[in-house]
Amino acid sequence: MAVTACQGLGFVVSLIGIAGIIAATCMDQWSTQDLYNNPVTAVFNYQGLWRSCVRESSGFTECRGYFTLLGLPAMLQAVRALMIVGIVLGAIGLLVSIFALKCIRIGSMEDSAKANMTLTSGIMFIVSGLCAIAGVSVFANMLVTNFWMSTANMYTGMGGMVQTVQTRYTFGAALFVGWVAGGLTLIGGVMMCIACRGLAPEETNYKAVSYHASGHSVAYKPGGFKASTGFGSNTKNKKIYDGGARTEDEVQSYPSKHDYV
């Protein structure tokens, strides 16, 4: 039961995380105008990965896409790439993990196959989460650098003849959404990897075989021989029924009447 719960929870957490990564990638508020020096501005600027927006005193908001590809900063392109890779990996991970879920039965898929798929999706979620966290962090670093550069240049332009305040940008809501979403995807991936350990068929139980030595009648029962899975030893107490080992989690479960979206 614990393995199913861990796997299911990992899937749900990753699903929320990937939805968050998609939302963050689409959001326009990656950077927002810093109002510290100009709290009374009637024109509020904010920027996303794909377009920049201006909210005017009328309440009207105008957004313009970045219609150039080559003219954009390399860092912005890198952030876009990281977020897209994160989304793609996460989406593939979700697809794989759906089939890997214990509560969903597909044909005669063996537990070893489900374990491998769970591990694969877990790794994909981990990489997806790391991509999102890296993308958001790179953008945040870019903002911090530009913020202090613009602060240094704020009163040096135009020889002080014109009172013009250079627009500075600070962290937007999308950064926090991205960090949280990346973290959730990462946690979900770790949970999937942990669930994989419980799914793997860790014990091979042989039926009792009698070896007749000359003059002696000794029976050797190597029923408790462990098959290595690479995930350490299993400490569970397992009952042996007719030479086959099955934990509580491995009891055959039939899909309940639910809609899987």
Epitope: V43, N45, S52, V54, S57, G59, F60, R64, T164, V165
Partner: antibody, heavy 115, light 113 residues
């Protein structure tokens, strides 16, 4: 078409309050801020502040902040501007305006403060 | 607060002639976010509310005749009427649309010579 229809002229005594209404039609009321502008007889224009019907947010000119209160009722698409503790220099035409670059204006409400 | 200074206070121009009204702001109205200047021009006739002519310093509102044009950047702006018509007699105001409180110029009264 976009229309802003304001309430009728008011005559008030000093120290009293007046509430001017501005009924909007022809556009999504919650999409744009409603601004209020004062014009004293024979004088120029003075911005009082705005109300954002979408979220109830507002911004006031400090000169009016302690006496002006802006509200809105989204169900009737109406914005209100209440001016309290009226003085003789509050005698003016009060306009509501909205749209990009204040493209749409109400016809104005004359408020006369006289003892 | 941003102070808007209009000049001249009044202007008399012959029909068909060019009329030029200037507006100067105490601070730049340029927004680096979209490279636009947030200045508005209005026309007001007696007993009427102001009518929007130009927003963002140079963008003509729909329905405004093309004889009206706006120019300028930063702190200095100009409204030009290329060929004055009788119906253009009015008071013209410029407005800071960049920083709160939104402020208006004192107005320029345009008459026919």
């Amino acid at each position: 078409q976009v229309q802003l229809v304001q309430s009728g002229a008011e005559v008030k005594k000093p120290g009293a309050s007046v509430k001017v209404s501005c009924k909007a039609s022809g556009f999504t009321f919650t999409s744009y801020n409603i601004h209020w502008v004062k014009q004293a007889p024979g004088q120029g224009l003075e911005w009082i502040g705005y109300i954002s019907p979408g979220n109830g947010g507002s911004n006031y000119n400090l000169k009016f902040k302690d006496r002006a209160t802006m509200t809105s009722d989204t169900s009737s698409s109406t914005a209100y501007m209440e001016l309290s503790r009226l003085r003789s220099d509050d005698t003016a035409v009060y306009f509501c305006a909205t749209g990009r670059g204040f493209a749409y204006w109400g016809q104005g409400t004359l408020v006369t403060v006289s003892s | 607060d941003i102070v808007m200074t209009q000049s001249p206070d009044s202007l008399a121009v012959s029909l068909g002639e060019r009329a030029t009204i200037n507006c100067k702001s105490s601070q730049s109205l340029f927004n680096s976010g979209n490279q636009k200047n947030y200045l508005i021009w209005y026309q007001q006739k007696p007993g009427q509310p102001p009518k929007l002519l130009i927003y963002r310093a140079s963008t003509r509102d729909s329905g405004v005749p093309d004889r009206f044009s706006g120019s300028g950047s930063g702190t200095d702006f100009t409204l030009t009427i290329s060929s004055l018509q009788a119906e253009d007699v009015a008071v013209y105001y410029c407005q800071n649309d960049y920083s709160y409180p939104l402020t208006f110029g004192g107005g320029t009264k345009l008459e026919i010579k």
